[in-house]
């Protein structure tokens, strides 16, 4: 997270980290006791999922292995459209005050809405500095028309843009798949942006979760 600050302790109990061994790979969110939602470009063969602590490496955190993941069937490695994936935990997460399910959206929030993006990704770019504590930054949703002025044809209609004019505030490496939360509901998953991260007036691009709630629910049912 660029130009952010540590999240208020316990304010993101649905935030997870996807680890490769002990190394941060991506962010994600807990949808229920068995399922984590993340970005399709975060796919690996096996995941270790960190839940229940704002601090990576915290011994009190839950660590659960996951071997099965289900990408959206329309994900394109060329255009990066439909960049979302469900990861099935090998064992159930234990819900607590520090481990909660995220609220999936019942509607798409409008441009101008203030939202928070969070993650353990690098706080500097292009040279990396990985924090141990979960970082947060507030950004505003940007209309597709305004975002298309920056990204032209690269922007697909299930992509959502967020940022602050003339500001560096953005996600970065390691934040991928993590949550953009607006008014208490999950509206985006970190997907891509320009590099180095935090170039003013280059918005972050997110998978627009409100367009995929049916696929999320259907996929969890299908692979119960």
């Amino acid at each position: 997270i660029i130009d952010g600050a540590p999240c208020a302790r316990g304010s993101h109990p649905w935030q997870v980290a996807l680890l490769s061994g002990n190394q941060l790979h991506c962010g994600g969110v807990l949808v229920n006791e068995r399922w984590v939602l993340t970005a399709a470009h975060c796919k690996m063969n096996e995941y270790t999922v960190h839940l229940g602590s704002d601090t990576l490496g915290d011994r009190r955190a839950q660590r659960i292995k996951a071997s099965k993941s289900f990408r959206h069937p329309g994900y394109s490695t060329q255009t990066h459209v439909n960049d979302l994936m469900l990861v099935k935990l090998n064992s159930q997460a234990r819900l607590s005050s520090m481990v909660k399910k995220v609220r999936l959206p019942s509607r798409c929030e409008p441009p101008g809405t203030t939202c928070t993006v969070s993650g353990w990704g690098t706080t500097t770019s292009p040279d990396v500095t990985f924090p141990s504590d979960l970082m947060c930054v507030d950004v505003k949703l940007i209309s597709p028309q305004d975002c298309t002025k920056v990204y032209k044809d690269l922007l697909e209609n299930s992509m959502l843009c967020a940022g602050i004019p003339d500001s560096k505030k953005n996600a970065c490496n390691g934040d991928s798949g993590g949550p953009l939360v607006c008014r208490g509901t999950l509206q985006g998953l970190v997907s891509w942006g320009t590099f180095p991260c935090g170039q003013p007036n280059d918005p972050g691009v997110y998978t627009q979760v409100c367009k995929f709630t049916k696929w999320i629910n259907d996929t969890m049912k299908k692979h119960r």
Partner: antibody
Framework: QVQLVQSGAEVKKPGASVKVSCKAS????????IHWVRQAPGQGLEWMGS????????NYAQKLQGRVTMTTDTSTSTAYMELRSLRSDDTAVYYC???????????????WGQGTMVTVSS | DIQMTQSPSSLSASVGDRVTITCRAS??????LNWYQQKPGKAPKLLIY???SLQSGVPSRFSGSGSGTDFTLTISSLQPEDFATYYC??????????FGGGTKVEIK
Amino acid sequence: QVQLVQSGAEVKKPGASVKVSCKASGYTFTSEGIHWVRQAPGQGLEWMGSISASSGDTNYAQKLQGRVTMTTDTSTSTAYMELRSLRSDDTAVYYCARSAGYGARHWYFDLWGQGTMVTVSS
Amino acid sequence: DIQMTQSPSSLSASVGDRVTITCRASQSISSYLNWYQQKPGKAPKLLIYGASSLQSGVPSRFSGSGSGTDFTLTISSLQPEDFATYYCDQWYSTPPITFGGGTKVEIK
């Protein structure tokens, strides 16, 4: 030290296959993409394809589709490029290169291997 | 696929000269264009990314400009170590990543 180190020069007969390796060090291999670019003697640069080190997702240049395979071994932080049914016009220096970006999209090559000369001759 | 056309294909210049190389895309690529320098027997090296941003460690005599279809690499005062071949590439519509044909800068 952040670097990509490639395997040594190869001489192959037409119709044979070659497999070039590219070992990464000094950075988290699984967090970046590896691309392969070749350069025939006295010619320009030609993009061959790419692989995501973590997911194994590949994209290949259309003209090489069916003849090229890119793989990675995350346990050794090594990328491989295999080219089959070699022809004389595959004679080139083959480079691996790391792409820079965040998330799903990358934007430029910020690190290159030293190159591997592959000669195809009967 | 987007075609990248570089011009000139070669040029002769003297130390201290101002040198300009152009790269034209067959369709708009916004500012997703990069410039590389390659010396004989060596791998390419990134000079400029995003059309105008100088890569860390690259001397400030190198600069890039342009957006859409027309781009320029300028060397404000050519140094002996700058004699090399220069390539542009585009990352807007990928795959494939496409390179320009190269511009060889030779000593006059």
